[in-house]
C-alpha cells in the first residue's frame, strides 16, 4: 500500500538568464527511494539520481543543470524555453512510484517573483 | 576493436560459489559501466546487476543482493562477478555487457560470449 | 520495477515480408528502450538504442518507434538471417533494469 506523499515546490517563476532550484520531497513513507528521475514537459530526461550509483545528467544538459541540492535539482542560465512543467518521478521499494509536479515560469522582466524558497537569486 | 572476453565453462556443485571474469580491451575501461545479464536454459534474458568501473560502485538486482558482488581490477581492465550459495535454479549462461558512459546511461552495446555456469551435485 | 511486455510471443513470418514486433513498459521510460536480437548459442546483438537509433552496423530493415510505454521493432523485409529471438530492454530505472520475455521471430 502506498502511504507516501511528494511535497513540491508547486509553481514558481524566475528570470531569465537566472537559475533555479526543482525540489520535491517524500514523506510520510519508509519505503527506500532507489531512484528518482527528473523529466521535463516534453517528458524527455533531465538527470537521474540512482541511490547506489549517484547522479547522470542527460549529456545534452551538463552545463546548464547541476545535482542538488538533495534529491533536487538546480536549473541554471534558464532561457524562456525552459517555461513548462517538471516531473520528479521517485521510484521506492516496496511501494513502488511516486510522482510529483512542479510548473516553472521563467520571465522576461527583472521583477521575477522570489516565491520559493528554493530559488536562487 | 572493442571487446569483452569470458572466462570459460564452470560445474559447480549446489552451495558453492562461481567467479566469472569479463576482461574488456579496445576502449577506455573507466569510462562505461558493465552489466551483467544470465540467461537459464530456453528462458530470457535476467538483468543481475550493474558496476561503475571507474569508482567500483554496484548495484544488484533485489533477488541476487547478498548473494552476489561484482568486482574490478583496473590495471587489467577486467571486471568479475561471484555468485555465492549457488543452486540448480542458478544453471544459466552468464554475459557480461557494456552499457553506456557512467556520465549517464545506455543501453548494452558490446557483449561477452557468454560463460556457462551448470550447478550439479 | 517496471514490466515490460511483448507481444506475440511467437511471429511466423515468411521471408520478404514485414515484421512487426510490439513491447510495453508499464510506466514511462522515455525513450529509454533498446531492442537487441539473439540466435541460438549466441550473446544478444543491440539493434535499437533510444527507441528509435540504429546501432552500428545494423541493416536500414530494422527500425524502432515509440515513446513512453509503446515500443515497435519493425523489420520491413525479412530476411533468412533474421529469424532470431528479440528482446526489448528499458535502461532508465534500476535495479533492476528490465528485459521484455521476447518474441521469437519464426519461419511461416
Known amino acids: 500500500m502506498m502511504t507516501g506523499t511528494i511535497e513540491t515546490t508547486g509553481n514558481i517563476s524566475a528570470k531569465k538568464g537566472g537559475s533555479v532550484i526543482l525540489q520535491c520531497h517524500l514523506s510520510s513513507t519508509m519505503a527506500q527511494v532507489t531512484q528518482v528521475n527528473w523529466e521535463q514537459h516534453d517528458h524527455s530526461l533531465l538527470a537521474i539520481r540512482n541511490a547506489e550509483l549517484g547522479w547522470h545528467i542527460y549529456p545534452a544538459f551538463k552545463d546548464r543543470v547541476a545535482p542538488g541540492p538533495g534529491l533536487g535539482l538546480t536549473l541554471q542560465s534558464l532561457t524562456m524555453n525552459d517555461t513548462g512543467e517538471y516531473f520528479c518521478t521517485y521510484h521506492t521499494y516496496p511501494d513502488g512510484t511516486y510522482r510529483g509536479r512542479i510548473f516553472l515560469e521563467v520571465l522576461e522582466s527583472s521583477v521575477a517573483e522570489h516565491s520559493a524558497r528554493f530559488q536562487i537569486p | 576493436q572493442v571487446q569483452l572476453v569470458q572466462s570459460g565453462a564452470e560445474v559447480k556443485k549446489p552451495g558453492a560459489s562461481v567467479k566469472v571474469s569479463c576482461k574488456a580491451s579496445g576502449y577506455t575501461f573507466p569510462a562505461y559501466y558493465i552489466h551483467w545479464v544470465r540467461q537459464a536454459p530456453g528462458q530470457g534474458l535476467e538483468w543481475m546487476g550493474i558496476?561503475?568501473?571507474?569508482?567500483?560502485?554496484?548495484s544488484y538486482a533485489r533477488k541476487f543482493q547478498g548473494r552476489v558482488t561484482m568486482t574490478r581490477d583496473t590495471s587489467t581492465s577486467t571486471v568479475y562477478m561471484e555468485l555465492s550459495s549457488l543452486r540448480s535454479e542458478d544453471t544459466a549462461v552468464y554475459y557480461c555487457?557494456?552499457?553506456?558512459?557512467?556520465?549517464?546511461?545506455?543501453?548494452?552495446?558490446?557483449w561477452g560470449q557468454g560463460t556457462m555456469v551448470t550447478v550439479s551435485s | 520495477e517496471i514490466v515490460m511486455t511483448q507481444s506475440p510471443a511467437t511471429l511466423s513470418v515468411s521471408p520478404g515480408e514485414r515484421a512487426t514486433l510490439s513491447c510495453r513498459a508499464s510506466q514511462s521510460v522515455s525513450s529509454n528502450l533498446a531492442w537487441y536480437q539473439q540466435k541460438p548459442g549466441q550473446a544478444p546483438r543491440l539493434l535499437i538504442y533510444?527507441?528509435?537509433t540504429r546501432a552500428t552496423g545494423i541493416p536500414a530493415r530494422f527500425s524502432g518507434s515509440g515513446s513512453g510505454t509503446e515500443f515497435t521493432l519493425t523489420i520491413s523485409s525479412l530476411q533468412s538471417e533474421d529469424f532470431a529471438v528479440y528482446y526489448c530492454?528499458?535502461?532508465?530505472?534500476?535495479?533492476?533494469?528490465?528485459f521484455g520475455g521476447g518474441t521469437k521471430v519464426e519461419i511461416k
Open positions: 555487457a557494456r552499457g553506456g558512459r557512467t556520465t549517464w546511461i545506455g543501453a548494452l552495446d558490446i
Open positions: 533510444g527507441a528509435s
Open positions: 558496476i561503475n568501473p571507474s569508482l567500483g560502485l554496484t
Open positions: 530492454q528499458q535502461y532508465v530505472v534500476w535495479p533492476p533494469l528490465t
